[in-house]
């Protein structure tokens, strides 16, 4: 086995090119200089290396950078990123959004892997907060990203970043998360008026207190049932029948189809039957 550690005559790699796909694993180990690999990482993706060969290339980089890869190398990892462990990634210092995008692109179409989760965590912690451009990027790749964060993590989202959030990004958020995001959305959109404001704030109303719902009920907003069903039960319960009727407008008829589901079910039970009857929907308290 000893002779395999020396590079055969004439096989020393001068550059990273397609000829290397014919190298055995031990030849790659012996004949490819790690520093050369690091400077020509951008070429690796264009070459159809096997997984075993990629393991060798990763090993060479690991030896060259035992404390973690520099960003100049990380940005060009491409498919080699899939070979990285969360432990490897924790050694990195990724500060460029371009680097983040390049690596997320490699994992595109797949569930968020532990590697990607670690990468994002490192990136966000390095930046100190989840700024708008980062949030834009992350939600583009992973629409559920925002709702994967804890309320504590969400508290570091600056209100200005809320402009990047699309309704579908909030689909899987629970009430505790929306409790954190709602005041940020109110701050972000506070200079908007009328229906424009309501359209923007609507997705965040799952974090709204009763007082805000009461105020909206007096302003002809015609909230749709999908939004109403996502409201906090404790925020809906104090609303009167008249307030719910005004809040939903023409959508009030949809209450009948939802009468067995929260928060509608719990709200119905709190109302006087005489009041419910004024809706003419046959709701039974």
């Amino acid at each position: 086995e000893v002779e395999k550690t020396a590079c055969p005559s004439g096989k020393k790699a001068r550059e990273i090119d397609e000829s290397l796909i014919f190298y055995k694993k031990w030849e790659l180990e012996a004949c490819v200089d790690a520093a050369l690999l690091a400077t020509q990482m951008d070429r690796v993706n264009a070459i159809p290396f096997t997984y075993e060969q990629l393991d060798v290339l990763k090993h060479k980089l690991d030896e060259l950078y035992p404390q973690g890869y520099p960003e100049s190398v990380i940005q060009h990892l491409g498919y080699l990123f899939l070979k990285m462990s969360p432990e490897d990634i924790r050694k990195w210092n990724v500060t460029s959004l371009e680097t983040l995008k390049a690596l997320l692109e490699v994992n595109k179409g797949h569930e968020m892997s532990p590697q990607v989760a670690t990468l994002i965590d490192r990136f966000v912690k390095g930046r100190g907060q989840l700024d708008k451009d980062t949030l834009d990027t992350l939600t583009a790749f992973y629409p559920g990203y925002l709702c994967s964060l804890s309320p504590e993590e969400l508290s570091s989202v600056p209100p200005s970043s809320i402009w990047a959030v699309r309704p579908q990004d909030l689909d899987t958020c629970d009430p505790r998360q929306l409790d954190v995001l709602y005041p940020k959305a109110r701050l972000a959109f506070q200079n908007m008026n009328g229906s424009e404001y309501f359209v923007k704030i609507q997705s965040f109303l799952g974090g709204a207190p009763t007082e805000d719902l009461k105020a909206l009920s007096q302003q002809n907003v015609s909230m749709d049932l999908a939004t109403f069903m996502k409201l906090r039960t404790d925020a809906v319960l104090p609303l009167t029948v008249a307030e719910v009727q005004k809040l939903l407008g023409p959508h009030v008829e949809g209450l009948k189809a939802e009468e067995r589901h929260r928060p509608v079910r719990d709200w119905i039970l709190r109302q006087r039957q005489d009041d419910l009857d004024t809706l003419g929907l046959g709701l039974q308290g």
Epitope: L187, F198, E211, D212, L216, Q219
Partner: nanobody, 131 residues
Framework: QVQLVESGGGSVQAGGSLRLSCAAS????????MGWFRQAPGKEREGVAS???????????DSVKGRFTISPISRDNAKSTLYLQMNSLKPEDTAMYYC?????????????????????WGQGTQVTVSS
């Protein structure tokens, strides 16, 4: 949630002046309204003056126009303060004065000082004007 605490009330002779203050804590946003209301013994609560926090709108009851001035919110760290400057006071201005807020106003006009629209209220401060 918004907490409102009024101060500055007291007794004054007709023709005198008072300045009421309302210290607001909690989340205040530009698209909220704040206002002053009053309630004389045996009478219903009525609107006095109101303002859209984001600016560009104030509204006064006819009975106080030209005498009372509601000032824009002054912000100082976590505390924000609303003022009502009351000049040329009359005995009929005697009442308990309340500071109130509307948590969301989709339009500035919604800030008109109509009691049923306002959903946060302070405890009130007494103003007595003697002749």
């Amino acid at each position: 949630q918004v907490q409102l605490v009024e101060s500055g009330g007291g007794s004054v002779q007709a023709g005198g002046s008072l300045r009421l203050s309302c210290a607001a804590s909690g989340n205040l946003y530009n698209n909220m309204c704040m206002g002053w209301f009053r309630q004389a013994p045996g009478k219903e609560r009525e609107g006095v003056a109101s303002i859209y926090i984001g600016g560009g709108y104030t509204n006064y009851a006819d009975s106080v126009k030209g005498r009372f001035t509601i000032s824009p919110i002054s912000r100082d760290n976590a505390k924000s303060t609303l003022y009502l400057q009351m000049n040329s006071l009359k005995p009929e201005d005697t009442a308990m004065y309340y500071c109130a807020a509307v948590s969301i106003a989709l339009t500035r006009e919604f800030c008109a000082p109509i009691v049923s629209r306002y959903n946060y209220w302070g405890q009130g401060t007494q103003v007595t004007v003697s002749s």
